[in-house]
């Protein structure tokens, strides 16, 4: 999934949760698979730089070789740099691993801009700040790439956490998480808390700009407030969901809900922005501009190109509206909404900010491949990928950035009829080209 805008999100030590902690409500969800409660050893196991993705430390091979791996729910290959590259400080050296097995098969993954290619094999893999297990997993050893690795991002590979259907070269290549669940007693569930910086960072801070948690095998209740609301996974390829309504500051965009999911809507930790289909993007920007009309921002800002800067500490969050996405609920004719703040969709850019300025990019952008709920959305919420029950849960993140007036929210239920009609049915053609649109 290419951050940047489908990164690779193409950013670390996290301090205490940013912003205000909200009071906990009573949990109302029914019993969940997996361990519940505390996963202390996995909390704060993600690092990254804003806009460049969140990564987890992993080890591959025997003896173990430590690498930082981008966590990507928008792809399904475990792929690591396996040859020298100007942007890599280290890479997987297969010849040094006694447990490496060559599958004698190549893999080629093109993106809209850039690509990677490599050789398939298997080796022993573990996650030091994860479950205490080692599994044999498929690994794509990247031998050649273009515009994939990011200078200074500090990650050397990508962990595709989506389903086998979109794995390369084909769906017979078992994804890492499938291997993990098959080979261990770990429940088929993981959850992500991505904690955005919320403010621009100077060069020193940028080395430790964002953090988060990937909880493998369950849900950690210290990472969210309120209750979890679940939306069905429509189809197990990407983590596809259905959006049934969109509001800007409570004003319905009033579009045919099929437009919101044209040609799909996915939850993708490997994309930086909230990406919207062209018609939806245009309507949303028009509405956001209208809501913030006391100010006028340059055209390039709305294109995600120009930065807008305010004197440090004076960003006028109040003039920007909240964005609400209504997601199909688990119960017939019932939906719930997730609401993000400008603190999520205005992305702080640290490399141009000075001590005098806070600078931001507009992190909502146009897509030709459907809605992508990237880090901009996920940084507001604790997101549970409940594969066992084919559903995705959202709760307000304990680390989301907000102010004293507004907070991100997950609220429901709302009555919404005919939600099944909101899904777009992709014509059944060769889907091998779908993964190339990662811009």
């Amino acid at each position: 999934t290419h951050l940047g805008i489908r990164l690779p999100l193409r950013s670390g030590l996290a301090g205490p949760p940013l912003g205000l902690r909200l009071p906990r409500e009573t949990d109302e969800e029914s019993e969940e698979p997996g361990r519940r409660g505390s996963f202390v050893e996995m909390v704060d196991n993600l690092r990254g730089k804003s806009g460049q993705g969140y990564y987890v430390e992993m080890t591959v091979g025997s003896p173990p070789q430590t690498l930082n791996i981008l966590v990507d729910t928008g792809s399904s290959n475990f792929a690591v740099g396996a040859a020298p590259h100007p942007f890599l400080h280290r890479y997987y050296q297969r010849q040094l691993s006694s447990t490496y097995r060559d599958l004698r098969k190549g893999v080629y993954v093109p993106y809209t801009q850039g690509k990677w290619e490599g050789e398939l094999g298997t080796d022993l893999v573990s996650i030091p700040h994860g479950p205490n297990v080692t599994v044999r997993a498929n690994i794509a050893a990247i031998t050649e790439s273009d515009k994939f690795f990011i200078n200074g991002s500090n990650w050397e590979g990508i962990l595709g956490l989506a389903y086998a259907e979109i794995a390369r070269p084909d769906d017979s290549l078992e994804p890492f998480f499938d291997s993990l669940v098959k080979q261990t007693h770990i429940p088929n569930i993981f959850s992500l808390q991505l904690c955005g910086a919320g403010f621009p960072l100077n060069q020193t801070e940028a080395l430790a700009s964002v953090g988060g948690s990937m909880i493998i095998g369950g849900i950690d209740h210290s990472l969210y407030t309120g209750r979890l609301w679940y939306t069905p996974i429509r189809r197990e390829w990407y983590y596809e969901v259905i959006i049934v309504r969109v509001e800007i500051n409570g004003q319905d965009l009033k579009m045919d809900c099929k437009e919101y999911n044209y040609d799909k809507s996915i939850v993708d930790s490997g994309t930086t922005n909230l990406r919207l289909p062209k018609k939806v993007f245009e309507a949303a920007v028009k509405s956001i501009k209208a809501a913030s009309s006391t100010e006028k921002f340059p055209d390039g800002f709305w294109l995600g190109e120009q930065l807008v800067c305010w004197q440090a500490g004076t960003t006028p969050w109040n003039i920007f509206p909240v964005i609400s996405l209504y997601l199909m609920g688990e119960v017939t004719n019932q939906s719930f909404r997730i609401t993000i703040l400008p603190q999520q969709y205005l992305r702080p850019v640290e490399d141009v900010a000075t001590s005098q300025d806070d600078c931001y990019k507009f992190a909502v952008s146009q897509s030709s491949t459907g809605t992508v709920m990237g880090a901009v959305i996920m940084e507001g919420f604790y997101v549970v990928f409940d594969r066992a029950r084919k559903r995705i849960g959202f709760a307000v993140s304990a680390c989301h950035v907000h102010d004293e007036f507004r907070t991100a929210a997950v609220e429901g239920p709302f009555v919404t009829a005919d939600m099944e009609d909101c899904g777009y049915n992709i014509p059944q053609t060769d889907e091998s080209t779908l993964m190339t649109g990662r811009a």
Partner: antibody, heavy 120, light 108 residues
């Protein structure tokens, strides 16, 4: 066609307040497509952005001058104004008003400028 | 803060010659850069915006190129009225407050 004209005293005493007005003719200052700005140029030196205003009254200022600058707009008179307080000799400059166009990014139309000297 | 450095400070050329002016940003400004011309006793005039787009009424002998950190203003064949000071300005970070120090194009 749209024109901008600066007006105000050419001489201001130190510690006093410099006041200039820019009159917009041939078009409306209330256009939603533009900001209206002030730039200055000390004699023999380069350009320094002072600040700008939208017809709604929303302002942006240069941080280095912010504590001393006020820009206001009068849509009924099709004018916007600059006030710079506590002036010193370092504020002696040609002051230009300008329109910020081309996607609200570039100064695409300028007034002819007015020289303000700070001296006792 | 993004700093714009113009070079050379002064360019001495004859009419009919080609002028090449440089503007370097301390970090990438994408293509959000403008060039202005200022003649003695006059206000600046917008020549180029978006790094390479000519403003209304600007002759074709003026052209801009570059993106990221390195930009060039080229005057293909200097006319007598082109001898002036030229400023670059970045608007990648907004509000549009950063100008370069200027390049003076003088008659040799």
């Amino acid at each position: 066609q749209l024109q901008l004209q600066e007006s105000g005293p050419g001489l201001v005493k130190p510690s006093e307040t410099l006041s200039l007005t820019c009159t917009v003719s041939g078009g409306s200052i209330s256009s939603s497509s533009y900001y209206w700005g002030w730039i200055r140029q000390p004699p023999g030196k380069g350009l320094e952005w002072i600040g700008m205003i939208y017809y709604s009254g929303s302002t942006w200022y240069n941080p280095s001058l912010k504590s001393r600058v006020t820009i206001s707009v009068d849509t009924s008179k099709n004018q916007f104004s600059l006030k710079l307080s506590s002036v010193t000799a370092a504020d002696t400059a040609v002051y230009y008003c300008a329109r910020v166009g081309h996607g609200v990014s570039y100064f695409d139309l300028w007034g002819r400028g007015t020289l303000v000297t700070v001296s006792s | 803060e993004i700093v714009l450095t113009q070079s050379p400070a002064t360019l001495s050329l004859s009419p009919g010659e080609r002028a090449t002016l440089s503007c370097r940003a301390s970090q990438s400004v994408s293509s959000y850069l403008a060039w202005y011309q200022q003649k003695p006793g006059q206000a600046p005039r917008l020549l180029i915006y978006g790094a390479s787009k000519r403003a209304t009424g600007i002759p074709a002998r003026f052209s801009g190129s570059g993106s990221g950190t390195d930009f060039t203003l080229t005057i293909s064949s200097l006319e007598p009225e082109d001898f002036a000071v030229y400023y670059c300005q970045q608007v990648y970070t907004w509000p549009p407050r950063t100008f370069g120090g200027g390049t003076k194009v003088e008659i040799k």
